[in-house]
């Protein structure tokens, strides 16, 4: 299927010409900005994103890596290293320290340095680190959190939360022993410790007592609140706040975005992590595009500008799984939204920023030609004489042994939603990796994003392009469009 | 998730034609790709036609200039409309969905339960 054109050198000088002349185009921003987005997917490695490139191109009926990815599109490109300070392949807390609070921390920590020791609540007074968008809110700015997990999970709660084990969700996640010493559950932190204007994503059960019924499942008890200390966390949220609403399903969600009197709007759309983007029901659920969609709406009624937080978490659980097809449709939304985040806001007082906390053992190989399905099968046979798909896992559960050898497998399997791909080694849940992950950058001062750095750059790229502790002053022109 | 269901299958002599129809449930339809597929007795399942998110369309060699895709997005169906059939066509015939023509052609992600066709002679 190889297209006449490419055939041609003409072809590869031309293209190649317009990206170098495009390329020297590129003037470095010397102004401030005004807003931050920081777009997180979550496990997104480099494999993730060339994959979703294929697959999303496949979907738009071409052959694949010919059509960039909304992401792709953005001029500065850094690599980002990941490690935990505890931990050479890192975990989606500690990473979310890093990118988001500008320090790295210790494996399942959150918001914390590394002088705080996982699951040891004694270690966490005096260790806090304070998040980008602590620092943006104290600004002035408006600032959200969007997500398609919990909002109460690891990468989301690095905005906020300052936690010595991050799956502390609710009270009845904390030992009674760390309740005593004065831990709060992440949920508790997400409405106490700072004033978010914005709040969409799952994780409704932990905002409310147990027993509670959930809206969406009544009769499933085990959907319902999950509170022991008999509170009812989004009640106090809405009592603390003139002009907050609370909604959990997409036309409330889409209303609510709409109305001016709207200051404050938290979403919880499920009790646990949301749907994936194939299991949605888009009567019922906002995508992730449509999420992101209505924070900016809100967002951008700030004349001193805003931070969001977006993530593609689910990215991340489809790969856990070994399912391919769900890590990359899951990167594929939140592509989408990055898209649709590009076309509501400027560059010229918008920085935006992609990565990934982490990598995962997911691998693209096997020589198949060019315009075959990403879900497809490798050319050849392997050793054994069996097939063998492009899209593999080092480890997981995808290993899987029939009468004591691999699996053959087919492409009317390999293509099912289902599908698990194989892996080397038998695990419960495929793992995390350690390589480096991409960053990619535009607006003002997305130059800066360049070279391999630390993780924890990031947050200072952010900090420093808005001016906000501790590079308030940066000695930057104020943001386009402004003249204070 | 996608539900597929196929209908319009049956007996018919050499030489002539049937529609198949295939319903699918789910509210994006328009976003997939679709493509029919068949399996003869004691034979594997073979390509038969897809038809793409964007209109494009691709058959198998074996029924170029017979067989006829196409779509109706508002219906979310789509038809294979097959002429001057062989008894070579006698197949139980599937409808398929995925992501993009390249996909659903190679690796579909969702199956109907299909429906037979037999062409006697």
């Known amino acids: 299927i190889i297209p006449v054109e490419e055939e041609n050198p003409d072809f590869w000088n031309r293209e190649a010409a317009e990206a170098l002349g495009a390329a020297k185009k590129l003037q470095p921003a010397q102004t401030a900005a005004k807003n931050l987005i920081i777009f997180l997917g979550d496990g997104m490695g480099v494999s993730t994103v060339t994959a979703a490139r294929i697959l999303k191109g496949q979907k738009k009926d071409k052959l694949g890596p010919e059509i960039p990815l909304a992401m792709d599109r953005f001029p500065y490109v850094a690599l980002s290293k990941t490690y935990n300070v505890d931990k050479h392949v890192p975990d989606s807390g500690a990473t979310a320290t890093a990118y988001l609070c500008g320090v790295k921390g210790n494996f399942q920590t959150i918001g914390l340095s590394a002088a705080a020791r996982f699951n040891q609540c004694n270690t966490t007074r005096g260790n806090e680190v304070i998040s980008v968008m602590n620092r943006a809110k104290k600004a002035g700015k408006s600032v959200g959190v969007v997500t398609t997990t919990r909002v109460q999970h690891a990468s989301p709660a690095g905005t906020y939360a300052h936690t010595v084990n991050r799956n502390w969700y609710s009270d009845a996640d904390v030992p009674a022993s760390a309740r005593q010493e004065g831990c709060q559950d992440i949920a508790t932190q997400l409405i106490s410790n700072m004033d978010i204007d914005v709040i969409l994503g799952g994780g409704r059960k932990y905002m409310f007592r147990m027993g509670t019924p959930d809206p969406e499942y009544p009769d499933d008890y085990s959907q319902g609140g999950t509170r022991l200390d008999g509170k009812n966390l989004v009640q106090e949220w809405l009592a603390k706040r003139q002009g907050a609403r609370y909604v959990w399903n997409r036309t409330e969600l889409m209303q609510a975005s709409l109305d001016p009197s709207v200051t404050h709007l938290m979403g919880l759309f499920e009790p646990g992590d949301m749907k994936y983007e194939i299991h949605r029901d888009s009567t019922l659920d906002p995508s992730l595009m449509e999420m992101t969609e209505a924070a900016l709406r809100l967002l951008s009624r700030n004349p001193r500008g805003f931070f969001l937080f977006v993530e593609g978490g689910r990215i991340d659980h489809g790969h856990h799984e070994s399912r391919a097809y769900r890590a990359l449709t899951e990167t594929i939304m939140f592509d989408d939204a990055i898209e649709r985040a590009g076309q509501l806001t400027s560059e010229e007082d918008t920085l935006s920023l992609v990565t990934a906390d982490h990598s995962h053992v997911f691998s693209f190989g096997g020589y198949p030609l060019r315009g075959s399905s990403i879900f497809g099968l490798a050319p050849g046979k392997a050793r054994d004489r069996k097939a063998y798909t492009v899209l593999l896992y080092g480890n997981g559960p995808g290993y899987v042994l029939k009468d004591g050898a691999r699996p053959d497998v087919t492409e009317s399997e390999s293509g099912s939603p289902e599908y698990r791909q194989q892996s080397a080694v038998p695990l419960d849940e495929e793992t995390h990796a350690g390589e480096d992950v991409a960053v990619f950058a535009r607006g003002p001062q997305a130059h800066l994003v360049h070279g391999v750095q630390e993780q924890t750059f990031i947050a200072h790229v952010m900090a420093f392009a808005a001016c906000l502790e501790p590079y308030t002053a940066c000695d930057l022109a104020p943001p386009a469009g402004t003249t204070d | 998730q996608v539900q597929l269901v196929e209908s319009g299958g049956g007996l018919v002599q050499a030489g002539g034609s049937l529609r198949l129809s295939c319903a699918a449930s789910?509210?994006?339809?328009?976003?997939?790709?679709m493509g029919w597929f068949r399996q003869a007795p004691g034979k594997e399942r073979e390509f038969v036609a897809a038809?793409?998110?964007?209109?494009?369309?691709e058959y198998a060699d074996s029924v170029k200039g017979r067989f006829t895709i196409s779509r109706d997005n508002a219906k979310d169906t789509v038809y294979l409309q097959m002429n001057s059939l062989k008894p070579e066509d006698t197949a139980v015939y599937y409808c398929?969905?995925?992501?993009?023509?390249?996909?659903?052609?190679?690796?579909?992600?969702?199956w109907g339960q299909g429906t037979q066709v037999t062409v006697s002679s």
């Open positions: 789910r509210r994006s339809f328009s976003e997939y790709a």
């Open positions: 398929a969905a995925g992501l993009g023509i390249r996909v659903v052609s190679q690796t579909p992600a969702y």
């Open positions: 038809i793409g998110w964007s209109g494009v369309i």
